[in-house]
């Protein structure tokens, strides 16, 4: 059998605050729980759900939760259910709501000397207690002329006077919380003494120079008084009027003229009526004085034919608001149609060539009229005049590609080399008309050049190829000076290109011919072996029929080779000694030695009291300190070749002697004593 | 020995009406679920509605707003009120409680 | 709603061979919540198994129920004669709106 270990109770609960209906049961088997409530199966919500077999309520709701809610457990097996005992919530709450006449049907019904019920609309449970105010005043119980029924939520005034007139609220109060009435309610109850508005003066926007009219009228029992004020109290009358307002005239119905107006008359006027009983009414009204600023100006527009696009006039600041209209060829644009003016926008719809032009916003109110011109462009598809031709540049001069187009507005041009877009920079350049100018023709800019020229409304290509006519060179120049080693095979290239292969040969310079041992083959000279006599002027020369001959001319010189005949070794000197590093070169022509030590090339007008580089090349560093350690490059080098060879130099602290070894005993180590 | 009687089959017009019955007897009706499945020929088993002790009730879509289940607790019978019947409603149908105890079944025909 | 599959459709056996009969279900069914059945031609169904491996009283012991999840078993160990039948397998959740499998028949080879 199912048995309930927990079952859920009747239980007081706030409205909008949490709770929970407990259940719990024992059964042989597994059984579903679920709820009910007022016998309907309970669905689970995000504010209502089962927690476990309980049922939570993130928030009780007075309506969705008013009932009697059951738990039963179910062994679907079998199909016997238990069902607990029923529970329901005595759920607190309060809720705000209006003060609403309850009496007389409505507020026209109202009169001096009659009953009034106003009733507050703040509901609750348990029952509240309500409490009236009276301009924020509270009303007690009791008090003259009014009752109070907190069962009937009602405020009787019996009889309502003018002295009841003023806002009523309630407020009210239980074990849940508070409310205040949501909308309150606006006794008037006229006294016939008291001064009553008939006409109240409106705000004015005048322009600079024109006349202004406040009216204003009062009715009372006797007739009430009637006064103008401006903003510093100054009293407006007919006999007595301030500095700044001499042309102001009251009239006998109250409204009140200012002629001429000028900025020191814009403020506030009021305008105050008095009854022989009652407060004094206060109405006030602005004098603004009309001003219109300036209007931004437009950038020019550039639409494309059978478009539809919008152009927005924004109205210069100013009082009143200035009105907005366009006009085009002087012409006011209608409120429909093609082209036509939608708010403050002008509208062209499947934009033509013929809408091309300038149209105008104009802008005005009371202060004047201000205008905007915005020039508008339909763009048309670029169309040839002339077309990039197929070239032949010439390489080493200027080269142009032509790419003449027409369109509006003035189409931009592109080229592209290769696919590849060209960016300006010193070797091409494109001109206005679109012109593509190559400064320095190379052979590498044979290839294929495309031109586009677009406007917004489209754009149209052409390509054609260039062909570069090469011009006869060296490729590359023969250095002009070079070595030949003595006694060692040679050879000194020499090749060039041209429009046709051209055909090359090695002279001498003085016309001699080559001797035999040196051979010309294909423009490369091969010295077999290098005597004393091959050095000399050797002339290289290029031919081809259309282009003629090039020359160049290569000074040879026959050198022996750099060999060192002393190099420098690995040398460890101590401290504070002389440091010697020997390095002898020989050569033809007789190389001459420079040092590098620790990076840096050692000048010898520069090198100090320490070191010395000598004749014979070798240097010496004296007082060595530790900061000389390093590695030191004897760099040999004549007109024909050079040649370098390096050592370390280390510097140590000198040694403190130990008893058993003898003075005579040598140093781990090379070591160079001085 | 727990029994389960069934009766009111028979044979109907689309959109008539039929009330099915079943008697339960051998333990404490008013304290179990109770609900009808029924079998069109040749198909599967299709739940129909199910009515709780306490009176709750539950319904497939197919059947809503045309079916009513209710129940007699002191004559121990369960009741299934079919109106508006369709030709797609003929099948044998069963009265059941818990998942061991099925009625002997009565047939339902639609038929014009 | 769950939907119950059960494969195959039809399965022919000889008695003394073991069945073994599939339910797959759409999403998740607590183990507790489902049951198998068997129907005879002109019969009510009859409880076999409920709470995926419990046999209901009177319910030989070559019969039993296994799996979890999405994936549930009814195998019959050693078939009799009398084992020939339509099988469907139901789930039975927190409402009381059952489902049903489609059936398995179980065929004499």
């Known amino acids: 059998a199912i048995v309930f270990i927990k079952q859920p109770s009747s239980q007081d609960a706030l409205q909008g605050r949490r709770a929970l209906l407990r259940c719990e049961v024992e059964a042989p088997g597994p059984v579903h729980v679920y709820w009910l409530l007022d016998g309907a199966p309970v669905q689970d919500t995000e504010r209502r759900f089962a927690q476990g077999s309980s049922l939570s309520f993130a928030a009780v709701d007075r309506l969705q939760d008013s009932g009697t809610f059951q738990c039963v457990a179910r062994d679907d097996v079998t199909g016997e259910e238990a069902r607990s005992a029923n529970a329901s919530f005595n759920i607190k709450w309060i809720e705000a709501g209006p003060v609403v006449l309850k009496h007389p049907a409505s507020e026209a019904e109202i009169q001096p000397q009659t009953q009034v019920t106003l009733r507050c609309h703040i509901d609750g449970h348990p029952r509240p207690t309500y409490q009236w105010f009276r301009d924020g005043t509270p009303l007690s119980d009791g008090q003259s002329n009014h009752t109070v029924s907190s069962k009937e939520r009602n405020l009787t005034l019996r009889p309502a006077g003018p002295e009841h007139s003023g806002l009523y609220s309630c407020c009210a109060h239980s074990a849940f919380g508070q409310a205040c009435s949501s909308q309150n309610f606006t006794l008037s109850i006229a006294d016939e003494s008291f001064a009553r508005v008939v006409l109240a003066p409106q705000d004015v926007v005048v322009a600079r120079y024109e006349e202004a009219m406040f009216h204003c009228q009062f009715s009372a029992q006797p007739p009430p008084s009637l006064q103008w004020l401006f903003e510093d109290e100054t009293p407006i009358t007919n006999r007595s009027r301030p500095p700044h307002l001499r042309r102001a005239t009251v009239f006998a119905n109250g409204s009140l003229l200012l002629t001429q107006v000028r900025p020191r008359n814009a403020g506030i006027y009021r305008c105050i009526g008095q009854g022989q009983r009652g407060p004094p009414i206060i109405l006030e009204a602005t004098l603004h004085l009309a001003e219109i600023e300036d209007m931004p100006l437009f950038e020019p527009r550039v639409f494309t034919a059978g478009s539809e696009e919008r152009v927005t006039c924004l109205p210069p600041k100013g009082l009143p608001e200035p009105s907005v209209w366009w006009e085009h060829a002087g012409v006011r644009l209608p409120t429909h149609g093609r082209v036509y003016q939608k708010g403050h926008e002008l509208v062209l719809a499947n934009i033509a060539e013929s809408d091309a032009g300038v149209y105008t916003c104009h802008a005005a109110n009371l202060a004047g009229q201000r205008r905007q011109d915005v020039n508008i462009t339909v763009a048309t598809v670029p169309s040839w005049l002339k077309k990039p031709q197929d070239s032949q540049l010439e390489e080493g001069k200027p080269g142009y590609l032509d790419c003449l187009t027409q369109a509006t507005p003035k189409p931009t041009v592109v080229w592209y080399r290769n696919q590849m877009l060209i960016s300006e920079d010193s070797r091409f350049e494109v001109f206005k008309n679109g012109t593509l100018r190559i400064n320095s023709v190379e052979v590498y800019d044979g290839t294929w050049y495309r031109c586009m020229s677009s406007t917004p409304a489209g754009s149209i290509e052409a390509q054609a190829r260039v062909q570069v006519l090469e011009k006869l060179k060296f490729t590359p120049p023969p250095q002009p000076q070079q070595c030949m080693e003595f006694d060692k095979e040679a050879t000194v290239p020499c090749s060039a290109t041209g429009r046709e292969k051209p055909t090359i040969k090695w002279e001498r310079a003085d016309g001699s011919s080559l001797p035999e041992w040196v051979t010309d083959n294909a423009g490369t000279l091969h010295f077999a072996r290098v005597t004393r006599d091959d050095a000399g002027n050797y002339t290289c020369i290029a031919s081809n029929g259309p282009q003629g001959q090039i020359r160049a001319h290569v000074q040879l010189t026959v050198a022996v080779f750099i060999t060192f005949k002393v190099e420098p070794e690995r040398t460890t000197v101590y401290q504070g000694h002389t440091a010697l590093l020997q390095c002898e070169a020989q050569g033809d022509p007789k190389p001459l030695i420079q040092w590098k030590g620790k990076d840096r090339i050692l000048d010898p007008t520069k090198l100090g009291p320490r070191m010395h580089i000598f004749q014979n090349g070798s240097l010496v560093i004296h007082d060595v300190a530790p900061e000389d350690s390093g590695r030191y490059t004897c760099i040999a080098g004549n007109s024909c070749n050079i040649k370098h060879t390096e050592a370390p130099l280390y510097v140590v602290d000198k040694p403190v002697p130990e008893e058993s070894e003898g003075p005579g005993s040598p140093p781990p180590y090379k070591m160079i004593q001085t | 020995e727990v029994q389960l009687v069934q009766s009111g089959g028979g044979l109907v017009h689309p959109g008539g009406s039929l009330r099915l019955s079943c008697a339960g007897s051998?333990?404490?009706?008013?304290?179990?679920?109770m609900y009808w499945v029924r079998q069109a020929p040749g198909k599967t088993l299709e739940w129909v509605s199910a009515?709780?002790?306490?009176?709750?009730?539950y319904y497939a879509d197919s059947v809503k707003g045309r079916f009513t289940i209710s129940r007699d607790n002191a004559k121990n019978s369960l009741y299934l009120q079919m109106n508006s019947l369709r030709a797609e409603d003929m099948a044998v149908y069963y009265c059941?409680?818990?998942?061991?105890?099925w009625g002997q079944g009565t047939l339902v025909t639609v038929s014009s | 709603e769950i939907v119950l599959t059960q494969s195959p459709g039809t399965l022919s056996l000889s008695p003394g061979e073991r069945a073994t009969l599939s339910c797959r279900a759409s999403?998740?069914?607590?183990?507790?919540?489902l049951a198998w059945y068997q129907q005879k031609p002109g019969q009510a169904p009859r409880l076999l198994i409920y709470?995926?491996?419990s046999r209901a009283t009177g319910i030989p012991d070559r019969f039993s129920g296994s799996g979890s999840g999405t994936d549930f078993t009814l195998t019959i160990s050693r078939l009799e004669p009398e084992d020939f039948a339509v099988y469907y397998c139901?789930?039975?959740?927190?409402?009381?709106?059952?489902?049903f499998g489609q059936g398995t028949k179980l065929e004499i080879k």
């Open positions: 999403q998740s069914v607590s183990s507790s919540y």
């Open positions: 709470g995926a491996s």
């Open positions: 051998g333990f404490t009706f008013s304290t179990y679920l």
């Open positions: 059941a409680r818990g998942l061991g105890y």
């Open positions: 009515i709780g002790s306490g009176g709750d009730t």
């Open positions: 139901q789930q039975y959740g927190s409402s009381p709106m059952y489902t």
